[in-house]
């Protein structure tokens, strides 16, 4: 069956049952997700607006899918397996009386079961499993997943163990104000800009002149040197780092376990062996991947490549190319393209270069 092909999953509570305090609903749902994140590499984050992977809905009777609820008792809730649109969504029958305790129907216990479905689990034949098809109250303070539940979810996503350490080659620190300095990759991370070169990165905090040099391994011991491309999805606190045909996911500045993964999971053809540069545009919710003289566009919501790509860089980014080393997005309208020791400020609304700079101009050189 289907699984989520990523480890950072968002959820949104569409509406609240009047049976409970909002805070209790939030807490029950958060703890239910935590049950599954404790035994997998998955990380769940609640968002309050926009399109989440998993939508939590309280509804009665007919509610927009084929599976109308049946009033009090009977079907308590249902959830769809991983996927886009309705995929992953969890629906709770508003005709039940939802509670934080043993009276009525316990929201936390029901949510743990439904989120199991949202993550791709089917029903279990083990009566001790939370994925057993019938509801039975157990003390929520001592609640544990059964061995069968854990086996099932880990067969889909693995366990939460850390990656193994990877060796780093020993390069000397490049001179920051060398006029010939080029970068391997550049990305924003919140209000900072990370510039990668060999086994080092420089950190530039927006609007402050001071920069600091760091070893990549000092911040992320499991990552290799020579990062070749990087991009950030700030709304998700995610940074993607690329080297050769692999990529790593950083969430909230921490490497996600079970990485690296193959770049081909993004949908690149087999001949693509590495990414030169990448940039995410939050206005379009698309990531642009630059490979040699071409680029691909990837839909981050639907997690698939847009049709009609690759395209030539020179054809669609006037004055840029044929190849680039690095790129990042800033100030809501600019891409900063790096080619060797030169940098181009490119207004993607006007679709033209607005400034030419040295690559290290950010450092007051």
């Amino acid at each position: 069956g289907p699984v989520w092909r990523k480890h950072y999953i968002t959820y949104r509570i569409n509406n609240y049952t009047p049976d409970m305090n909002r805070e209790d609903v939030d807490y029950a749902i958060r703890k239910a997700f935590q049950v599954w994140s404790n035994v997998t590499p998955l990380k769940f984050s609640k968002i309050n607006t926009g399109m989440a992977d998993i939508l939590v809905v309280f509804a009665r009777g007919a509610h927009g899918d084929f599976h109308a609820f049946d009033g009090k008792g009977g079907i308590l809730a249902h959830a769809f397996g991983p996927g886009s649109g309705i995929g992953g969504d969890a629906h709770f029958d508003e005709d039940e009386f939802w509670t934080t305790h043993s009276g009525g129907t316990n929201l936390f216990l029901t949510a743990v079961h439904e989120i199991g479905h949202s993550l791709g689990l089917g029903h279990s034949s083990d009566p001790k499993a939370v994925m057993f098809p019938t509801y039975k109250y157990v003390d929520i303070n001592t609640f544990r997943l059964s061995a069968d539940d854990i086996r099932g979810i880990q067969s889909l996503y693995g366990d939460p163990k850390e990656n193994q350490r990877l060796p780093n080659p020993d390069n000397s620190e490049p001179a920051l104000c060398d006029p010939n300095l080029s970068f391997d990759a550049v990305t924003t991370v919140g209000n900072k800009i990370f510039f990668f070169k060999d086994r080092f990165f420089w950190l530039k905090v927006s609007e402050r002149p001071k920069t600091s040099v760091n070893l990549i391994s000092s911040l992320w011991p499991t990552l290799p040197s020579g990062i070749e491309a990087a991009y950030e999805i700030e709304a998700r606190n995610q940074v993607f780092l690329f080297k050769d045909d692999k990529y790593w996911l950083i969430s909230n500045l921490r490497p996600e376990p079970n990485y690296p993964k193959s770049i081909h999971s993004f949908g690149f053809p087999n001949f693509v062996k590495k990414i030169d540069a990448a940039v995410f545009n939050p206005r379009f919710y698309r990531t642009y991947f630059f490979v040699d003289n071409q680029y691909w566009r990837y839909d981050e919501r639907r997690q698939m490549m847009d049709p009609g790509y690759p395209k030539l860089i020179t054809k669609n980014f006037q004055g840029i190319g044929p190849k680039i080393d690095a790129v990042f997005y800033s100030k809501n309208k600019y891409y900063y393209f790096f080619q060797g020791s030169n940098q181009f400020e490119y207004d993607f609304l006007l679709q033209r270069i607005t400034k030419t700079l040295k690559s290290n101009s950010w450092f007051g050189c």
Partner: antibody, heavy 122, light 103 residues
Framework: EVQLLESGGGLVQPGGSLRLSCAAS????????MHWVRQAPGKGLEWVSG????????MYADSVKGRFTISRDNSKNTLYLQMNSLRAEDTAVYYC???????????????WGRGTLVTVSS | DIQMTQSPSSLSASVGDRVTITCRAS??????LNWYQQKPGKAPKLLIY???SLQSGVPSRFSGSGSGTDFTLTISSLQPEDFATYYC?????FGQGTKLEIK
């Protein structure tokens, strides 16, 4: 490439029976919910029936309940619609359509066959 | 049962026009609404799912919006191949269709 090909349509008298088939290829048929949707001449689309990947869950529109039976043979990658007690108002092009994977139907019809015409007339 | 009301039932427009079709549900269906295009003698084709997500291979001039009860399909700049009938749908309920004709 996903392909759906309906067959079995034709002219039948009121009260008669007909069995439609839909041959599927290009995807793991047994994973997906499948549906029948019909369209009377010059009219809009009307959902008729749906069946889960395993065949264990079925659903019907009120207008056909008790008269039509949806089934599938996953070993043959084929979907069926057995239509009994046919009426003039069942005259339509019948399309089979693919839905999503999973225990519940989303009603998201991403691939459709070309349709087969059923005419109920005396 | 939930009812879907689509408007207008027919619409005349010219190539290059911006066109909007609306669909209203009788009660909240969250974002569980899909849009299809059908040309004469052909099977319907999925354009937009989950109210606003563009189906793979569909041109970006098509867009969808809305949640709850009110939904919109917009074609930003009509092309000759866009003249067709458009249906909204949630679960087993289709709107009655909007026929888009050349002015």
């Amino acid at each position: 490439e996903v392909q759906l090909l309906e067959s079995g349509g034709g002219l039948v008298q009121p009260g008669g029976s007909l069995r439609l088939s839909c041959a599927a290829s290009g995807f793991t048929f047994s994973d997906y919910w499948m549906h029948w949707v019909r369209q009377a001449p010059g009219k809009g689309l009307e959902w008729v029936s749906g069946i889960s990947g395993s065949g264990g869950s079925t659903m019907y529109a009120d207008s056909v309940k008790g008269r039509f039976t949806i089934s599938r043979d996953n070993s043959k990658n084929t979907l069926y619609l057995q239509m009994n007690s046919l009426r003039a108002e069942d005259t339509a092009v019948y399309y089979c359509a693919r839905d999503i994977v999973g225990p519940y139907s989303a009603g998201l019809f991403d691939y459709w066959g070309r349709g087969t015409l059923v005419t109920v007339s005396s | 049962d939930i009812q879907m009301t689509q408007s207008p039932s027919s619409l005349s427009a010219s190539v290059g026009d911006r066109v909007t079709i609306t669909c209203r549900a009788s009660q909240s269906i969250y974002t569980y609404l899909n849009w299809y295009q059908q040309k004469p003698g052909k099977a319907p084709k999925l354009l937009i799912y989950a109210a606003s997500s563009l189906q793979s291979g569909v041109p970006s001039r098509f867009s969808g919006s809305g949640s709850g009860t009110d939904f919109t399909l917009t074609i930003s700049s009509l092309q000759p191949e866009d003249f067709a009938t458009y249906y909204c749908q949630q679960a087993g309920i289709f709107g009655q269709g909007t026929k888009l004709e050349i002015k």
